[in-house]
Interface confidence: low
């Protein structure tokens, strides 16, 4: 029969060349001389030349090394003419299929991958993911599949493995408790990515992870007590700057303290606000004092953040003695 | 005062070895990564590879398999160790302090600089 | 890898007067999360290894002279010297380290009018 089942060659072949792939052979041969001929992209049209046909013989030849990942399939058509070039066959489909070889290395699509999770959050959580590419055939072989894995960890605390990359998809999440801004507030991952689903070529990659700030920290008062002296009857007189430290993240929400009296200001005469730079909270005068009525008051103030903490944390509270100095006061009549 | 200092330079012949040295003082060594950065004669300034504080690497891709760094942090010292060298190479070799020790600060960018060793590569 | 291409090559400026020196980057070095330019500038004098100047693309190292001031975002980089010095004769490289492998630029190389 002038029929050819479809052809395989396998890509970056050694030679030599040309070499011999498969015979076209017409019954009509007994009859008459057949001269062979094929057409199609790769035979006569771009790109010309890469197969040919011995005219007398119908041997289809190869005649250079091919290129899976530039030409998969080759779709050629066989002729067969009489010596006089009356075509004695209907043209014959000749489908030349490039079988793929491990040639390409898997590519990240980024130098550096960049992602953020936030602190204390439970293993399992995803944080980012990363993509390699390879051009190999990942269908039929494994040669273009691609095994993700973590080399290593930067810096290694609490332990070296806070992290873990599927294998298959590249995501990386969290697989250890423990991440903690304040200690270690970004990791650096060299990542890997492997063809032949992780038996093959390798390369490498990084993904820096930011650990992002929770509020996890109370602010503190430092110092806790403090004795201050106030003139009488002054309004908006500055009585004492509270000084707070908290580890959370310098002007951010879970920084930036919140200050109440929570005690000792019966007759409301105490205003405290937060200064926007320093944090500190400022105890002022909302109202004059009288020496004669209470000439000492004992102020106990909470602190705590804008930001609700994220666990249960103790607060601190600071304790401030409020000394009232007499005033020389006109007599009243 | 934060102090490098590159050592074992020299001419060599192409496919030759050379390991250089950069000793550090004056900063917490441990803590910063540490880049190495060459210079050819009269050319502009080409990154080699960094090493972190864990003894993780990366690489620029024309010395990557024939160039290797290491550290030894009890004593404050990077080493690069240089294989199969070519003409190419030739240039002088400097180590940089990055200046941070996280990237948010400005971990990339390199501080302080030692001198200098220069490294020929001739037959 | 990111290309850093510097220009001008060579620039010649007259003491006290201005000078500015531009970089572009292949690929933006702006990181969406933190908002900041992975990007520095150095200053390199004859004989002597380089001097970083500027990092973040805007923010200037401690000891460099306020005279000294970078801008630009994603991908262009301004490096300006208000008032130029006879000391400020160099050669200039940009640096971007938002991705490895780190790499400069050509450089440019400042001279006095």
């Known amino acids: 029969d002038w029929v050819v089942a479809p052809i395989s060659v396998p890509e970056n072949g050694k030679g030599p060349f040309p070499q011999r792939l498969n015979q076209l052979k017409s019954n009509k041969d007994r009859d008459t001389k057949i001269f062979y001929s094929i057409t199609g992209p790769g035979a006569d049209s771009p790109p010309e030349g890469v197969f040919a046909v011995e005219k007398e013989t119908g041997w289809l030849l190869l005649n250079k090394p091919l290129d899976r990942e530039e030409i998969a399939k080759y779709e050629l058509f066989g002729h067969a003419v009489s010596e006089n070039g009356a075509s004695v066959e209907d043209p014959m489909n000749i489908s030349i299929i490039v079988t793929d070889q491990n040639d390409h290395k898997p590519k990240f699509t980024q130098d550096t991958f960049r992602g953020s999770v936030l602190e204390g959050v439970l293993p399992g959580t995803s944080v980012m993911q990363v993509t390699a590419t390879d051009e190999d055939d990942a269908i039929y072989t494994y040669n273009g599949v691609v095994a993700y894995s973590i080399h290593s960890q930067e810096p290694k605390d609490p332990h070296d493995l806070m992290f873990t990359i599927h294998r298959s998809t590249g995501t990386i999440s969290v697989i250890s408790s423990g991440l903690d801004r304040e200690k270690v507030p970004e990791y650096t991952l060299t990542i890997q990515a492997t063809d032949m689903d992780g038996d093959g070529s390798t390369t490498t990659a990084v993904a820096v992870v930011e650990i992002l700030d929770a509020n996890d920290n109370a602010p503190m008062f430092d110092p806790q007590k403090y004795e201050a002296h106030v003139p009488e009857n002054a309004v908006g007189h500055e009585v004492q700057r509270l000084t707070v430290t908290d580890l959370d993240a310098p002007n951010s929400p879970a920084w930036r303290a919140t200050y109440l009296i929570m005690g000792g200001d019966d007759g409301d005469h105490f205003t405290i606000t937060t200064h926007p730079e320093s944090n500190q909270g400022i105890l002022t005068t909302r109202k004059g004092l009288d020496f004669e009525a209470k000439n000492q008051h004992t102020l106990y103030v909470e602190v705590t953040n804008e930001a609700p903490f994220v666990l249960k944390l103790p607060t601190s509270t600071a304790t401030i003695v409020v000394h009232v100095e007499d005033v020389n006061e006109a007599p009243v009549f | 005062e934060v102090q490098l200092l590159e050592s074992g330079g020299g001419l060599v012949q192409p496919g030759g070895s050379l390991r250089l040295s950069c000793a550090a003082s004056g900063f917490s060594f441990s803590s910063y990564p540490i880049n190495w950065v060459r210079q050819a004669p009269g050319k502009g300034l080409e990154w080699v590879g960094v090493i972190w504080t864990g003894g993780g690497t990366n690489y620029a891709s024309s010395v990557k398999g024939r160039f290797t760094i290491s550290r030894d942090n009890s004593k404050n010292t990077v080493y690069l160790q240089m294989n199969s060298l070519r003409a190419e190479d030739t240039a002088v070799y400097y180590c940089?302090?990055?200046?941070?020790?996280?990237?948010?600060?400005?971990?990339?960018?390199?501080?302080?600089w030692g001198q200098g060793t220069l490294v020929t590569v001739s037959s | 890898d990111i290309v850093m291409t510097q220009s001008p090559d060579s620039l010649a400026v007259s003491l006290g007067e201005r000078a500015t020196i531009n970089c572009k980057s292949s690929q933006s070095l702006l990181y969406s999360s933190n908002q900041k330019n992975y990007f520095a500038w150095y200053q390199q004098k004859p004989g002597q290894p380089p001097k970083l100047l500027i990092y973040w693309a805007s923010t200037r190292e401690s000891g460099v002279p306020d005279r000294f001031s970078g801008s630009g975002s994603g991908t262009d980089f301004t490096l300006t010297i208000s008032s130029l010095q006879a000391e400020d004769v160099a050669v200039y490289y940009c640096q971007q380290y938002y991705s490895y492998p780190y790499t400069f630029g050509q450089g440019t190389k400042l001279e006095i009018k």
């Open positions: 940089a302090k990055s200046r941070g020790v996280y990237d948010f600060d400005g971990r990339g960018a390199m501080d302080y």
